[in-house]
């Protein structure tokens, strides 16, 4: 029988390569049974995850899963970093794996490094 616990399906060690100036939607896939949980996004700062209070978010409902979306309109260079979603369910806090955004500044897009280069050399992101 399928578990009725809330589950957050951000893939472990997932990464996204995005351009500053573009719109972007970061999805947190959420599985729940009856009542939709309260879900929030935070951005990692060292070992602390800082809650993103004043950011545009929305829900997208599909047949077997829902998505809690963090909107970047547009992506800014300082959006670079790792994000996590978390859900409150029956007074338990459920945390997702973190997902990392590698933001390339549009000014340097002509010499844009490869995705793999960005993953292995994150200082490229701050040029």
């Amino acid at each position: 029988k399928e578990s009725c616990d809330v589950q957050l399906y951000i893939k472990r060690q997932s990464e996204h390569s995005i351009l500053a100036g573009d719109p972007f939607e970061l999805e947190c896939p959420v599985k729940y049974c009856a009542n939709r949980p309260h879900v929030t996004w935070c951005k990692l700062n060292g070992t602390t995850c800082v809650k993103l209070e004043d950011r545009q978010t929305s829900w997208k409902e599909e047949k077997n899963i829902s998505f809690f979306i963090l909107h970047f309109e547009p992506v800014l260079p300082n959006d670079n970093g790792s994000y996590r979603c978390s859900a409150n369910f029956q007074s338990n806090l459920i945390e997702s794996h973190s997902t990392t955004l590698y933001v390339t500044d549009v000014k340097s897009a002509s010499e844009r490094p490869s995705k793999d280069e960005m993953a292995s050399r994150p200082w490229l992101l701050y040029r």
Partner: antibody
Framework: QVQLQESGPGLVKPSGTLSLTCADS????????IHWVRQPPGKGLEWIGR????????RYNPSLKSRVTISSDKSKNQASLKLSSVTAADTAVYYC?????????????WGQGTTVTVSS | DIVMTQSPDSLALSLGERATINCKSS???????????LNWFQQKPGQPPKRLIY???KLDSGVPDRFSGSGSGTDFTLTISSVQAEDVAVYYC?????????FGQGTKLEIK
């Protein structure tokens, strides 16, 4: 049941490009990661790299990175491997494997493997 | 890169004997999420690897309970409590914590 199947030419000329495809008939590839692993004759397993088919983000083995490209086609539910400037040392059985995702994240399903020989 | 070193390279045992294969990683495999992504694979001639154990000690479905895994940090062990003829294979450890992913060099198990 997850079924992965590698396909591609069994013979590649030295300095040419090896091209293989991995078709996944049992799972939506965007929900997981697809890895490529190779095994030279009589030797051990070597991880080549992986792709997140949801967004195309790749990770490669640094020892092969300058020559390897992994891509995916969500509409065909398949991933591809290209290895350029091949030599006899690239002769191996090439496997694709699926990472099983939440909550275990390990290589749970493998293709049968396809043998690629580099020879003129 | 994380180097995975298995020992021994090969072992020959009689049926019913206990097999112990060790795997040592050059760095801790404990991930930020508190899990240790250390896996064991079995490969028989002409076949792809088959996952036996994941997350150090969890047995894959259908794997006989004579197989077990243990360890933490950098030191891991695969144990076969009573070796059977069908266990003849090469066994590999694999780490899924760090990039690049890496395998041990393999341990060949034979029957005396």
């Amino acid at each position: 049941q997850v079924q992965l199947q590698e396909s591609g030419p069994g013979l590649v000329k030295p300095s040419g490009t090896l091209s293989l495809t991995c078709a996944d008939s049992g799972f939506n590839i965007k929900d997981t990661y697809i890895h490529w692993v190779r095994q030279p004759p009589g030797k051990g397993l070597e991880w080549i790299g992986r792709i997140d088919p949801a967004n195309g983000f790749t990770r490669y083995n640094p020892s092969l990175k300058s020559r390897v490209t992994i891509s995916s086609d969500k509409s065909k539910n398949q991933a591809s491997l290209k290895l350029s400037s091949v030599t006899a040392a690239d002769t191996a059985v090439y496997y694709c494997a699926r990472e099983d995702g939440y909550p275990y994240y390990t290589l749970d399903s493998w293709g049968q493997g396809t043998t690629v020989t580099v020879s003129s | 890169d994380i180097v995975m070193t298995q020992s021994p390279d090969s072992l020959a045992l009689s049926l019913g004997e206990r097999a112990t294969i060790n795997c040592k990683s050059s760095q801790s495999l404990l991930d930020v999420d508190g899990k240790t992504y250390l896996n064991w694979f079995q490969q028989k001639p002409g076949q792809p690897p088959k996952r036996l154990i994941y997350l150090v000690s969890k047995l894959d479905s259908g794997v006989p309970d004579r197989f077990s895994g243990s360890g933490s940090g950098t030191d891991f062990t695969l144990t076969i409590s009573s070796v059977q003829a069908e266990d003849v294979a090469v066994y590999y450890c694999w780490q899924g914590t760090h990039f690049p992913r890496t395998f041990g060099q393999g341990t060949k198990l034979e029957i005396k």
